[in-house]
Interface confidence: medium
């Protein structure tokens, strides 16, 4: 692969755990203005596999608020508006990075953490296990 | 709200930009072992709004690899396996936090960045009603 030379203007680190411990500027560069998933689209209501959004709050985590999707039905909504159990509503999950205060309650010291969140739901054909 | 007292064992910060610049331990605490979305489930293929996963790589970002979903069709797959344009496949998007090397090419200095990623697709009733 291509080796990119280290920028000579990089800050030095005297931390004994370097490079595991790094400096992070929390002044977020944000290309997206809308952070409330309920406002960003109404897909959660219009989907054939609709979902509800649950607020998950944890002051020891950054971001402290994460929205979790929970599928409303086991089946999917058909053209009549009824739940069809020949299809399944399933959550689409994604691993995301969060910052966890470590040690706890410290304002300036964090550890990266990966968590699995459900972002929304999709309608899938079920895997049918045929009984022999 | 409840004020949580600061832990007396917190590291000190002499950074003039504190609390904007913090120390982060990159030794990730990960509850999830499977990071390849193609292995985690086959929903992307079984969905009525199937999607393809595209690898987005950026060495100046952490994580350097992010998988982006692109819906395969404008419409949704009906029970016969045909694409029906009376419904729409749409991407489910989520804002996630990533670390951007700042200054560029620095191994130990980052800035938090929010980016919008498409995680998967769901099938929705169109806002424009094709039939009045």
């Amino acid at each position: 692969g291509i080796t990119i030379p280290r920028n000579p203007g990089c800050p030095n680190s005297e931390d004994k755990n370097f490079p595991r411990t790094v400096m992070v500027n929390l002044n977020i560069h944000n290309r997206n203005t809308n952070t409330n998933p309920k406002r960003s689209s109404d897909y959660y209501n219009r989907s054939t596999s609709p979902w509800n959004l649950h607020r998950n709050e944890d002051p020891e985590r950054y971001p402290s608020v994460i929205w979790e999707a929970k599928c409303r039905h086991l089946g999917c909504i058909n053209a009549d508006g009824n739940v069809d159990y020949h299809m399944n509503s399933v959550p689409i999950q994604q691993e995301i990075l969060v910052l966890r205060r470590e040690p706890p309650h410290c304002p300036n010291s964090f550890r990266l953490e990966k968590i699995l969140v459900s972002v929304g739901c999709t309608c899938v054909t079920p895997i049918v296990h045929h009984v022999a | 709200g409840i004020t949580i007292p600061r832990n007396p064992g917190c590291p000190n910060s002499e950074d003039k930009n504190f609390p904007r610049t913090v120390m982060v331990n990159l030794n990730i605490h990960n509850r999830n072992t499977n990071t390849n979305p193609k292995r985690s489930s086959d929903y992307y293929n079984r969905s009525t709004s199937p999607w393809n996963l595209h690898r987005n790589e950026d060495p100046e970002r952490y994580p350097s690899v992010i998988w982006e979903a692109k819906c395969r069709h404008l419409g949704c797959i009906n029970a016969d396996g045909n694409v029906d344009y009376h419904m729409n496949s749409v991407p489910i998007q989520q804002e996630i936090l990533v670390l951007r090397r700042e200054p560029p090419h620095c191994p130990n200095s980052f800035r938090l960045e929010k980016i919008l990623v498409s995680v998967g697709c769901t099938c929705v009733t169109p806002i424009v009603h094709h039939v009045a």
Partner: antibody, heavy 116, light 107 residues
Framework: EVQLLESGGGLVQPGGSLRLSCAAS????????MGWVRQAPGKGLEWVSS????????GYADSVKGRFTISRDNSKNTLYLQMNSLRAEDTAVYYC?????????WGQGTTVTVSS | DIQMTQSPSSLSASVGDRVTVTCRAS??????LNWYQQKPGKAPQLLIY???NLQGGVPSRFSGSGSGTDFTLTISSLQPEDFATYYC?????????FGQGTKVDLK
């Protein structure tokens, strides 16, 4: 083989009525929107009406609204077009078609002639 | 109602020619645009759906492009069996209007 077969066309006097049928085979009829398209002699195609899989939602061209009624019987795999108060300008070949947004399967057409 | 205007109304071409038919919608229809081919005495056949998707079984010499209000059907190398009338249709909103047709005949 996926097939649509129209019937019920014929000669009718102005003001009269006619009911067209379209028998579907080779696919799961109840999964699909269905529609009617007509073509007057020497003219282009004109969309007439469409109906959703359950039959719960229908749409009509302005030229036939209030006079034509689309319906379906999923148990019989059949699509219908009830045409009342027929006019000379309704003279055309009427096609039934499977409707996926684009009409991907068509019948051979049935001719309706409105004349005194 | 959305008006669909095709041009030209007719064109003469030779086998092997590249043929282009355009369709303009009176308002934006995103990519909800279909193209059909019809031969005399026959039912129409779907060629392209969703502006650019080739219907199964249709030769790859047919292609579609465009979005919003302006769309194009292209036949890269005209074959003898392609002499026919071509129609565009919007499926964005009811009524699902067709263009007036473009007749492609032998020069």
């Amino acid at each position: 083989e996926v097939q649509l077969l129209e019937s019920g066309g014929g000669l009718v006097q102005p003001g009269g009525s006619l009911r067209l049928s379209c028998a579907a085979s080779g696919f799961t009829f109840s999964f699909y929107w269905m529609g009617w398209v007509r073509q007057a002699p020497g003219k282009g195609l004109e969309w007439v009406s469409s109906i959703r899989p359950s039959g719960g939602m229908t749409g009509y061209a302005d030229s036939v609204k209030g006079r034509f009624t689309i319906s379906r019987d999923n148990s019989k795999n059949t699509l219908y077009l009830q045409m009342n108060s027929l006019r000379a300008e309704d003279t055309a070949v009427y096609y039934c078609a499977r409707d996926l947004g684009g009409m991907d399967v068509w019948g051979q057409g049935t001719t309706v002639t409105v004349s005194s | 109602d959305i008006q669909m205007t095709q041009s030209p109304s007719s064109l003469s071409a030779s086998v092997g020619d590249r043929v282009t038919v355009t369709c303009r919608a009176s308002q934006s229809i995103s990519i909800y645009l279909n193209w059909y081919q019809q031969k005399p005495g026959k039912a129409p056949q779907l060629l392209i759906y969703g502006a650019s998707n080739l219907q199964g079984g249709v030769p790859s010499r047919f292609s579609g492009s465009g979005s919003g209000t302006d769309f194009t059907l292209t036949i890269s190398s005209l074959q003898p069996e392609d002499f026919a009338t071509y129609y565009c249709q919007q499926s964005y909103i009811t009524p699902r209007t067709f263009g007036q047709g473009t007749k492609v005949d032998l020069k």
